[in-house]
């Protein structure tokens, strides 16, 4: 008796597909061992057709896959474009050889069934319409025309030419003739449902001279498309319902027993479980739209349906499209914290993952907005200048090659709280959703800059100091000059970090930046920050104004370490960096297949596309190394 379980018999028809699930006992060894699907020959030998090691036989090339779901203790074999040659005995199993644990599966593929020659078959999808053609002889032209549906005992009238209509077809059935052709009438039935499927007879005339035609109407539920996605990745449901519903409200819902619960629709309804990680995007005037869900969770797996109806809710007899979404917990997308906490006046450093194989891809950060259908305007990107309202407080640091880029936002206010997406123009699965929570500051900031009101005088020397607590002693301190293309890190040496002193004097820990001599280009925002390797931590910002010396006044340059800045920015260390050990991550967002879509979804203004260096030190037009001298007091 095998511990592997699956379907003993599978039957289908030519051209169709099968999805065979095999269940295995819940052990670590089983979860990680090779899975296979083999065909049994007359000799008893079982020839591998596909395995989880990546093997794919020639006869399955391009039409089969095998996917392991270790969290469910199952694996699935999908085979498409079936032919009668696929009929046979198979095994699904586990183990390094095909003699391991296995289960016997019999697959039978038959020809498409044929109906009697006098029956006309119409095959339509749910929600669509059908026009049945009913020919008749000229002598029956003046006679009554009708269509009836066969039941066990009789044939129940659907519609006739005297305008009698069955109550269940009112508003859906029309009997008509085209032009001057007196040898054929037509019956159109719209908003087809499963109940409309069956055998019909159309008739012209009565008695033995009547013209009759048998019709078999097949109403199909759309075959669900199988979608396999990784945990924390994103999924796009591309819904194409046709021009006839182009002006109706659109929805995406998830099946729950026999109801379908709306997740999002174009009338503004949205399931709270998807807050911050879903967008619905009308594509064109042909009834096409897409729904993007990011940061996939285990519980997002299930059966989804998209449709259109003026109510924005599922209605029988309206066109639908369906998917079955599987969420694989063996994800390549790193597990990162989904909630980042900051305080008013403070800063956050958000580490955004991207596919390390695509280090040259363009990186973006956008803010999810739930109004309307939802959109995500880009705030900053490697070739998108920082939005004006974020001047001096937002920058993107690209660290090519290591699979992470960092977005820093400082001078936080409670209005910054919300959902943000990390995304690239590359692999669309790597989209992360971050929820930023901003609490009111309750204590002094960790980093403080003096002087607070910084006005430098042209041609003179100007020094600003950044005070930091002892807990940052071992971290790298830096100053950078902010521009809307990034924050250019200025050359520095941190003498304090190299001192082998064990003690730390809280009052004397500071890193200074000196502008000598001050030029007009030095005006702008400067950031003082801490980082450890490529992991960025807290920052604080200061605006340095540059003015010409006024005659008769001598400019005092305050560098007194006790002149503490009261507006300096604060952030709790535990929450400021996204790289901490205890991060309990999840989401990762997902839309935008290409750059243009980022614009479309985010309603991006043209100026956002301006090119430029986004925070890497080598793209700056002006080198500051000769001017900016950093030293430690």
């Amino acid at each position: 008796k095998s511990p592997i379980f699956g379907p003993q018999e599978v039957s289908s028809i030519e051209g169709d597909s099968v999805s065979i699930t095999c269940y295995y006992p819940d052990t670590s060894v089983n979860r990680h061992t090779r899975k296979y699907w083999c065909r049994q020959g007359a000799s008893g030998m079982c020839t591998t057709l596909i395995s989880s090691n990546g093997y794919l036989s020639k006869e399955y090339s391009g039409r089969a896959n095998l996917i392991n779901f270790p969290e469910n203790n199952t694996f699935v074999i999908n085979i498409e474009q079936l032919t009668q040659d696929d009929t046979g005995s198979y095994k699904c199993g586990l183990g390094t050889s095909n003699r391991g644990l296995s289960f016997d599966v019999s697959l039978e593929v038959s020809q498409v069934p044929e109906l009697p020659s006098d029956t006309h078959v119409y095959t339509k999808d749910i929600g669509r319409n059908v026009t049945i053609e009913c020919p008749f002889k000229r002598e029956n032209a003046p006679s009554k025309k009708s269509l009836c549906k066969k039941t066990n005992q009789s044939c129940e009238l659907v519609i006739d030419s005297t305008e009698k209509v069955n109550p269940s077809y009112i508003g859906r059935a029309k009997l008509f003739m085209k032009g001057t052709d007196l040898t054929v009438f037509y019956v159109n039935i719209s908003h087809l449902t499963h109940n409309d499927a069956g055998l019909y007879i159309c008739q012209a005339g009565e008695g033995p001279s009547a013209d009759k035609k048998n019709v078999d109407l097949q109403v199909l539920a759309p075959e669900p498309e199988l979608l396999y996605k990784d945990l924390r990745s994103s999924v796009t449901f591309e819904c194409d319902l046709g021009r006839e519903v182009a002006n109706e409200a659109k929805y995406l819902c998830r099946m729950n027993k026999e109801t379908c619960d709306v997740i999002i629709n174009t009338l503004g309804k949205r399931d709270p479980d998807f807050e911050g990680r879903i967008l619905i995007t009308p594509k064109d005037d042909n009834g096409r739209f897409s729904v993007l869900i990011t940061g996939l969770r285990k519980e997002d797996a299930g059966h989804y349906q998209c449709g259109a109806h003026s109510s924005g809710l599922p209605q029988e007899g309206w066109p639908i499209q369906t998917w079955q979404l599987f969420v694989n917990e063996e994800s390549t997308i790193p597990n990162r914290r989904s909630v980042v906490k900051g305080v008013t006046g403070g800063s956050v450093a958000i580490a955004c993952p991207y596919n390390p194989k695509e280090s040259s891809s363009l990186k973006y950060w956008c803010r999810w907005e739930g109004d309307g259908n939802g959109h995500c305007p880009v705030l900053v990107g490697t070739q998108a200048q920082v939005q004006e309202e974020y001047e001096g407080r937002l920058a993107l640091f690209d660290q090519p090659g290591n699979g992470t880029y960092t977005v820093i936002l400082n001078q936080l206010t409670t209005e910054d709280a919300g959902f943000y997406w990390c995304l690239t123009n590359g692999d669309s699965r790597w989209r992360t959703t971050i929820e930023l929570q901003v609490a009111e500051a309750t204590r002094e900031p960790n980093l403080e800059v003096t002087p607070q009101n910084a006005t430098a005088v042209l041609g003179e020397t100007f020094t600003v100091s950044c005070h930091y607590p002892c807990k940052f002693y071992s971290q790298e301190k830096y100053w950078c000059k902010w521009s809307n293309k990034g924050c250019h890190i200025l050359p520095s040496h941190d003498e304090g970090a190299r001192q082998s002193s064990v003690s730390c004097d809280q009052s004397s820990q500071l890193v200074s930046m000196t502008l000598n001599p001050v030029s007009k280009e030095d005006e702008g925002w400067y950031w003082c920050g801490v980082k450890q390797g490529q992991t960025y931590g807290e920052t604080t910002a200061i605006y340095i104004a540059v003015e010409e010396r006024t005659r008769g006044s001598s400019h005092v340059n305050p560098t007194d370490a006790n002149a503490r800045a009261k507006v300096a920015l604060e952030e709790e260390v535990v929450d400021s960096s996204i790289s901490e050990k205890e991060n309990k991550a999840i989401p990762n967002p997902g839309p935008f297949a290409n750059e243009r879509e980022i614009q479309n979804v985010g309603d991006q203004a043209q100026e956002n596309r301006a090119s430029g260096d986004a925070g890497s030190a080598d793209g700056q037009s002006r080198s500051s190394s000769s001017k900016h001298h950093h030293h430690h007091h």
Partner: nanobody, 129 residues
Amino acid sequence: QVQLVESGGGLVQAGGSLRLSCAASGRAFSSGRMGWFRQAPGKEREFVAAISWSGHTTYKYYADSVKGRFTISRENAKNTVSLQMNSLKPEDTAVYYCAARQSLVAGGDPRGQSEYDYWGQGTLVTVSS
């Protein structure tokens, strides 16, 4: 709401046959799963057989104890599922329950009772030796 009605139970001698039927009221399921479970006196309810379908594709599942003796089948137009039971044994004596899941695609392990949304009242099968 879908209602399931079982029929065909009764008394039969060991080695004999019975055919159980389960009729689902309401509209035809375009895809889904129907199964048979049984509960012998003083024992837990256990899986017997199941059938899943979507479009023209059908999947049949059997418990090891009934493999080769029982056959599950479905009549699409009538919305019914049947269980043909041959070579019956005294240990097959139980109340047989029909269960159904109406869904776009049938979900998890068909042996799990939580996989089914609707249940019938049961029909008693007694196999005498």
